[in-house]
């Protein structure tokens, strides 16, 4: 029995549980998740019974090795699965746990102008960042377009400060989860601080 | 990848018993049950037996007990399948083919085979 | 010994269509059964095993189904190169046993 192995998928791919084991007599190999039983093996015979009709198609077992490999994953295949192999020439069975993560592939993220103010001529925007998938393990950063892979902001929240007669730079959000990453459209400061001006004078207009 | 390596033909006299190999590479050797099949020409096959490599546990077709003895050497990898007393009902092509671990009687790599020809 | 019967001798078939080889066993053997394909002057070929699992890397147009006694092997898309001696084999139990083959032919 070794540590808890740690697995991630993505919706709609496969993961592969790793399982090797030195047993030569392996008389069932019973895996479960979320203490459901899911497939039950037994080598000998080479009978495998999926317990759930809906799973079959799911199910495989690559090189024709004792690894499960499960397909056409949903987000609630995430939660804890469990592998025991039993044997005549094994005092108790040798088990293995795994913990598996099913994220969705991100969204493209949406920037949202938060508040903004425009005085003495400088122009602070608050940008913020967001997907579908807020919360799921999913990280924001902002990056200058243009500026190579460097990151100069982590985190959804972005506040920025533009002087009137600067150079306009493009900004863009990257979102990331452990399956994925997606780019929000560039925005541009100098846009959204002459945009946030105009509003303004029509408004006082 | 996994690989096995049988000569690819044997001519024997009758009565003269002929030791065929199989050598196996690309995955552990002695993890893997390994089978021999026997196919006379233009005929079906027939499973003579299975060997174990980790402790030569072997499992043989009652039709075959007085014919085929299966041996194997872990230190080169190769599993052996000796015929004793041949005769031209004996002249076909054997195979060795290795087990799968999720059936253990279900053979995912096979050698080319051995053509035996038994003849005076 | 458990007698693994395949009826059908040889079948024609054409490009593209779909063809099904059954296989009997003389007793039940849940779902230990296994599919070969064998072309000539080569080793057999492992297609399927426990009765509907696809081997590693075998086209999904081979599937395979059935419990107990009776198993179905299906082609669909039959192509050129599908022609071949398509064996059936139990390993429920030993000795292992195989079916007489079934010859795909063109028509």
């Known amino acids: 029995s070794g540590p808890v192995k740690e697995l991630v998928g993505s919706v709609g791919g496969a993961v592969t549980f790793p399982l090797k084991s030195k047993v030569k007599q392996v008389d069932s190999i019973v895996w479960t998740f979320n203490t459901t039983p899911l497939v039950t093996i037994q080598p000998e015979g080479g009978t495998i019974i999926v317990t759930q009709n809906r799973n079959r198609e799911r199910v495989d077992f690559p090189d024709g090795g004792y690894s499960l490999k499960l397909s056409k994953l949903k987000k609630n295949d995430s939660g804890i699965y469990y592998v025991g192999i039993y044997s005549s020439s094994l005092q108790q069975p040798s088990t293995q746990e795994y913990v598996l993560h099913v994220y969705e592939h991100l969204s493209k993220p949406k920037v949202t102008i938060d508040r903004q103010s425009n005085k003495n001529g400088t122009c602070v925007i608050n940008l913020t960042c967001s997907t579908d998938q807020d919360g799921e393990n999913v990280t924001y950063s902002w990056k200058a377009v243009g500026q190579g892979d460097n990151q100069f902001h982590d985190g959804a929240t972005l506040s920025i400060a533009w002087r009137s007669g600067e150079k306009d730079q493009a900004l863009t959000c990257m979102a990331r989860n452990p399956v994925s990453n997606s780019f929000s459209t560039p925005v541009f400061p100098q846009k959204l601080c002459e945009d946030a001006a105009t509003d303004l004078t029509s408004l006082r207009g | 990848q996994v690989q096995l390596q049988q000569p690819g033909a044997e001519l024997v006299r009758p009565g003269a018993s002929v030791k065929l190999s199989c050598k196996a590479s690309g995955y552990s050797f002695t993890t893997y049950w390994m089978n021999w099949v026997k196919q006379r020409p233009g005929q079906g096959l027939e499973w003579i037996g299975m060997?174990?490599?980790?402790?030569?546990?072997?499992r043989l077709n009652q039709k075959f007990k007085d014919k085929a003895t299966l041996t194997v050497d872990k230190s080169s990898s190769t599993a052996y399948m000796q015929l004793s007393s041949p005769t031209s009902e004996d002249s076909a092509v054997y195979y060795c083919?290795?087990?799968?671990?999720?059936?253990?009687?279900?053979?995912?790599?096979w050698g080319q085979g051995t053509s035996v020809t038994v003849s005076s | 010994d458990i007698v693994m019967t395949q009826s059908q001798k040889s079948m024609s078939t054409s490009v593209g269509d779909r063809v099904s080889i059954t296989c009997k066993a003389s007793?039940?053997?849940?779902?230990?059964v296994a599919w070969y394909q064998q072309k000539p002057g080569q080793s057999p070929k492992l297609l399927i095993y426990?009765?509907?699992y696809r081997y590693t890397g075998v086209p999904d147009r081979f599937t395979g189904s059935g419990s107990g006694t009776d198993f179905t092997f299906t082609i669909s898309n039959v192509q050129a190169e599908d022609l071949a001696v398509y064996y059936c084999?139990?390993?429920?139990?030993?000795?292992?046993?195989f079916g007489a083959g079934t010859k795909l032919e063109l028509k």
């Open positions: 007793q039940d053997v849940i779902t230990g």
């Open positions: 084999q139990q390993h429920y139990s030993t000795p292992l046993t």
């Open positions: 083919a290795r087990s799968t671990m999720i059936a253990t009687r279900a053979m995912d790599y």
């Open positions: 426990s009765a509907s």
């Open positions: 060997i174990h490599p980790s402790d030569s546990e072997t």
